[in-house]
Structure formats: C-alpha cells, structure tokens
C-alpha cells in the first residue's frame, strides 16, 4: 500500500490552501480590474512574450533544476509549480496594494503580471534550500511570507533610495539566497542513519535538472531585461546577459574539469555555474558598455561558482543541513553579492571619471540598499523558519525527508512507507 499524508495534514492542507485561494479570489473580486487602455497589438505581443519567458523560467527552469534528488523529483517539480501559481496571485495583489491602493483599485497590466512572476521566482530560488524537508502546507506559509517580505523590501528601497523597478528587483538574487539559507538553518538538520541515499542525485533526475538549467540559460536574458522600460536599455541588457551566460557555460565546464583530480566534469557544478554570468551581471546588465566586459564578468562568475560549488557544500551541509546538490542557495548568495559589487565598482569608476565628488554618497546608497536586502531576507527567513517549525504544520519526519512517497500516490508500488 502506498503511503499517505499523516491524517492531520490531510485535513490541514486542503483546508488551508483552498481557504487561502478563496480569500485571494475575494480580494481579486473587490480590489482589482484590468487595464482598460487600448494596447498597440505589436507591443502587447512583445510584452506578453517577456512574461511567457519568465513563466517558462519559473515553471520549467527552476522546477526541473531542483529535481535532481533520487527520490524527490516529482515533489520538486510539482511543488515548484504550486508555489509559483500561489506566489503570482499574492504578488499581484501585494504589489498593487503597496503601489496603487490609495486609488482603491489595483489595475492589472501585463507589466504587473511580469513583476509578480519575478517576485514568485524569488520563492523558487529560496525553496531549493528546504525542498524535501517540508510539506506543501509549510510551503504555502513560505510563499506568503517571502512574497510579502520581498514586496515590502522593494517598496522601501524604491521610496528611500529612489530606485526604479529593475534596480530594486535585482536584489532578488541576494534576497532569495539569504532568505532560503536562513529558513534552512531553522529546520531540523541531521539526516538519520540509513536515509543518506535519498538526498543523492540519480541519472534521470540529474538529466531533468540539466534540462532545467538549459531553460534558465536560454531565458536568463529575458529575466534581466524584463523590468527595463526603454527598448534600447532592454536590448543592451539582453546582449550583455547573453555574452555573460555564454562565457559562464564555457568556464563552468572547463572549471569543473579543472577542479576534479581526474579531470571529470561534475553535474552539480555545471547545473549552477551555467547561470553564474546571468546572476553576476543582473544589476548592471543595461549599464555595461561593451561585450568584452560582460564576458569578463561571466568568466569571473563562472570561476567563483565552480569554486563555491567545490568548497561551500560541506559547510552548508554541516551548518544548515542543505544537501550537496542544492546548489542555488550558496551559489546565488555569492553571485548575487558579486553582481552588487560589480554595480558599485562601475558606479565608482564612472564617478571618478566624471570627477564630481559624489563617490562616497553613491557607494553609501548602494551599500545601504544591499545591506537592507540582506537584513530583511535574514529576518524574514528566520521568522519563516520559526513558523515552519510549529507543530500545526505536521512537518515530515526527518526519516521521511527527500521522499516522493510521503506526498504522492504511486499505485505500482507494493511497499509504502
């Protein structure tokens, strides 16, 4: 007989999720309406395509990237989709309430859907650090808290530092990474004896994880340019991101081979490092003036990513209980920081060139933004971790970590848990 959810969770999950969905429907009914303007058809199609790219990245890219566990691939993909669907709904409302609510109505445009998808993507990056150790009811909590925290962070940064949509959304890498790591730190860590094999990767799931990485690689230019309004800025962002991710792929595969004593290539290194360039140039992708600079940044990011993948998992596993194949947390925390530092360095060089004496002020503002993003990520992550530890969620027992059978019906299996 196949295993089932514990009784209490069977009662809790559908009730919790459906009540929440009903509440969201009511909020949409009372507070939202569609943008009534006559869109230029060509512009509408272009705008929709960017949103579609983001959805592909989230559902297929991040969904499959996290599916490399031997016995947790189904849950990784499906739970990602569940979180994306829920996160987008809540993010649309939240962004509307924070930016438009004085008018009493939230106007939904293709741009607001794009913004919401990117907010939901933050959760999918963070969740990599905890997937396999939590159930769907807990993931619902994580979605709500993280989307709310990110939305408020963006609003605060926008108001205090006067940054535009692109600049304040590009903190997503650092925010998502530190949020996920701090949630993971709060969850029960040790894997009991005899269950270590579950967090190991298998060939078929690793192939699907590589498929996820490929989708992310293909659409990363769309992600980095999605919130830029001007077509010229968007074009430059696309070009620079493309050059950076192209070089980071070459660096990842070469560096992975270099890092292995027998010159073999690690799947895990490649999964993460192929995306390195895209994360590293995210903040400054539209400001980079020439391809060679984007390529150099891609190279540096690829090397840092491979180095991080080689030396950090041991530390993450010991301290945070994150399995070796969950590479996004430490990868994005390193590369997100690199991206922010690159932006600050470019600002400094530019300000020195202009000779306008504003270096200190500009750097202070940028460091202030970054620090705020990290602090809010850590605080909200710890709060989420504490919430997820509450008994009401009936978290899976440590012995049932990383196991699809805890959550899924497999009729062909004779033996359940």
């Amino acid at each position: 007989m196949s295993s089932k959810y514990p009784r209490s969770v069977r009662r809790c999950l559908p009730l919790w999720a459906l009540t929440l969905e009903a509440a969201l429907i009511l909020l949409f009914y009372f507070f939202t309406h569609y943008d009534a303007s006559l869109e230029d058809q060509k512009g509408l199609v272009a705008s929709y395509q960017v949103g579609q790219d983001l959805t592909v990245m989230a559902a297929i890219g991040l969904g499959f990237l996290t599916s490399s566990f031997r016995r947790h691939s189904w849950s990784s993909v499906a739970f990602n989709l569940f979180m994306l669907a829920l996160g987008v709904q809540w993010a649309i409302l939240l962004d509307g309430f924070l930016s438009q609510f004085p008018s009493g109505k939230v106007v939904i445009t293709l741009f607001s859907i794009r913004l919401a998808t990117m907010s939901a993507l933050s959760v999918l990056i963070s969740v990599d650090a905890v997937l396999g150790k939590v159930n769907l009811a807990q993931l619902v909590v994580m979605v709500l808290v993280e989307v709310t925290a990110l939305g408020n962070l963006r609003m605060v940064i926008s108001n205090i530092f006067n940054t535009d949509y692109h600049m304040n959304m590009m903190h997503i890498y650092v925010f998502a990474a530190y949020f996920g790591l701090s949630v993971a730190w709060c969850l029960p860590k040790p894997l009991p004896e005899g269950t270590e094999d579950k967090d190991q990767t298998a060939t078929i799931p690793s192939l699907s994880a590589m498929l996820g990485a490929l989708f992310l690689w293909m659409f990363w230019p769309s992600f980095n340019s999605a919130l830029l309004r001007s077509p010229i800025e968007r074009k430059n962002a696309v070009f620079n991101t493309y050059y950076a991710v192209a070089v980071s792929v070459v660096t990842a595969i070469s560096g992975s081979s270099l890092a292995h004593p027998q010159g073999k290539i690690s799947k895990t290194y490649v999964h993460s490092a192929v995306l390195a360039g895209g994360v590293a140039v995210g903040t400054s992708c539209h400001l980079i003036p020439s391809p060679w600079l984007a390529m150099v940044l891609g190279l540096v990011a690829g090397l840092i990513s491979v180095g991080g993948a080689k030396y950090l998992p041991g530390c993450c596993n010991r301290v945070l209980g994150i399995p070796h194949s969950s590479i996004m947390g430490y990868n994005f925390s390193l590369l997100g920081l690199l991206g922010e530092i690159i932006y600050i360095v470019l600002l400094v060089l530019d300000t020195v060139g202009a000779g306008n004496g504003m270096i200190g002020f500009q750097v202070l503002l940028s460091i202030g933004e970054l620090s705020l993003a990290i602090v809010i990520a850590l605080m909200s992550g710890l709060l989420t971790g504490l919430l997820l530890n509450l008994k009401i969620w009936k978290a899976p027992h440590e012995a049932k970590y990383f196991d699809d059978q805890v959550f899924w019906k497999f009729p062909h299996l004779a033996v359940g848990f």
Partner: antibody, heavy 129, light 108 residues
Framework: QVTLKESGPVLVKPTETLTLTCTVS??????????VSWIRQPPGKALEWLAH???????SYSTSLKSRLTISKDTSKSQVVLTMTNMDPVDTATYYC?????????????????????WGQGTTVTVSS | DIQMTQSPSSLSASVGDRVTITCRAS??????LNWYQQKPGKAPKLLIY???TLQSGVPSRFSGSGSGTHFTLTISSLQREDFATYYC??????????FGQGTKVEIK
C-alpha cells in the same frame, strides 16, 4: 520636419473623463529611440510631467496621478492618446505632448539620456461646471 | 520621487549681463539633467541635455554644468530674446521625470 499636435475638448465638467490625442509626423512611434510624453502646465505654474509611452508600448505614469491616467498609442495612425479620469477644476491647464528622444553615450557605464526635443503647441483644457 | 529645486525663482537682468541659474536635486542624478526655455504663451524649447550638451540650433552663449545634485545654467551675455522662464528637468529615474519650479528672467 518633426511636428506634434494636441487635440481634445476645450471644456470638461468636473468628474468627467478627459481624452487628449497627440498626432505626430516626421518620425515613427515604432522608432526604438523615440517615445512620447504628456506634460501639463496650470496657468502661471510650473511644468508637470504626466505620462510616457515607449516604442515597445511600455508605459510610465506620474506617481501622484497614476490612478487617473491611461496612455496608449496607435502606431498606424501615428497617434498617442492620454485619458484622465475624474477631472477637477485644479486640472485646468495647458496640456502638451512632446517627443522624448534617447541619446546613448558609452563611457565606463552606458548613459541613457532622455530629452524632450520637440513639443506640440499645447491645448488648453478648462475644468468647470 | 526626486525633487528639483531651482534658485532664484525670478531675477532681473540687463542685456549683456552674465546670468546664472541653479538647480538642485534631492538626490544624486549624475548628469541626467535637461534645461528648457519657455516664453509666454509658447511651448517649452530644449536648450541643454545631459547637463552640459547644447541642443543643435541653440546659441553658444548658453552653457550648462554640474553633476550629482548641483547644476547650473549660464547665459554668458543676455540677449533680448532670452527673457523667458527656464526649467530644469531630471531624467535619472527612467521614466519618472520631474521638473523644477522654474526661474523667470525679467528685464531690469
């Protein structure tokens, strides 16, 4: 020769919706380096930027008036339309449309300089019952 | 939003005078600043963009300088046709563009 011409009602009643049209010639609304902005100027007061539309149909609005404004364009007719809901006597002003030109300069970073290089002659709108 | 403050709000000068108008931004806007001239009953006209680049067709007596938060528009030798109102505008945050409150240059 680049020209922009605003058209719309001269008189609007309070709470009504104002619809203004800007017809452009001499450049295309699909040109990636061009966009169209709406600006207004109440009698004896300063200029106030209202809304902007880029060639790729991306839009942006003044923070304070965001909830009341809608900008759209019809590239085939070379027209940009601004609608402003719930008009009030304080909205009495001369409304201008202007071409927003992008000049790109590459240095240590890439600069995107926007400037309103060609303006329409303006249309005066009075809000009164 | 970024606030732009111009000073003085008005000034009186004679033909041939050197006139300087100042514009301050509430935060650093690098060199993303434009200057416009507006005569009564007319639409504004672009004079300078990118803080210091003269728009084609604008006389060379007009010049702009500054970066960060402090900018100036200078008319080296005021002509009769220069009596007008001058506005600064920031374009740093694409695209939430704000104008200063204006400086009126009158005949003394």
């Amino acid at each position: 020769q680049v020209t922009l011409k605003e058209s719309g009602p001269v008189l609007v009643k309070p709470t009504e919706t104002l619809t203004l049209t800007c017809t452009v010639s001499g450049f295309s609304l699909s040109n990636a380096r061009m966009g169209v902005s709406w600006i207004r100027q109440p009698p004896g007061k300063a200029l106030e930027w209202l809304a902007h539309i880029f060639s790729n149909d991306e839009k942006s609005y003044s923070t304070s008036l965001k909830s009341r404004l809608t900008i759209s364009k019809d590239t085939s007719k070379s027209q940009v339309v601004l609608t402003m809901t719930n008009m009030d006597p304080v909205d009495t002003a001369t409304y201008y449309c202007a071409r927003m030109r992008l000049t790109m300069v590459r240095g240590v970073i890439t600069y995107y300089y926007y400037s309103m290089d060609v303006w329409g002659q303006g249309t005066t709108v009075t809000v009164s019952s | 939003d970024i606030q732009m403050t111009q000073s003085p709000s008005s000034l009186s000068a004679s033909v041939g005078d050197r006139v300087t108008i100042t514009c301050r931004a509430s935060q650093s806007i690098s060199t993303y600043l434009n200057w416009y001239q507006q005569k009564p009953g007319k639409a504004p006209k672009l004079l300078i963009y990118a803080a210091s680049t003269l728009q084609s067709g604008v006389p060379s007596r007009f010049s702009g300088s500054g970066s960060g938060t402090h900018f100036t528009l200078t008319i080296s030798s005021l002509q009769r046709e220069d009596f007008a109102t001058y506005y600064c505008q920031q374009t740093y945050r694409t695209p939430t563009w704000t104008f200063g409150q204006g400086t009126k240059v009158e005949i003394k």
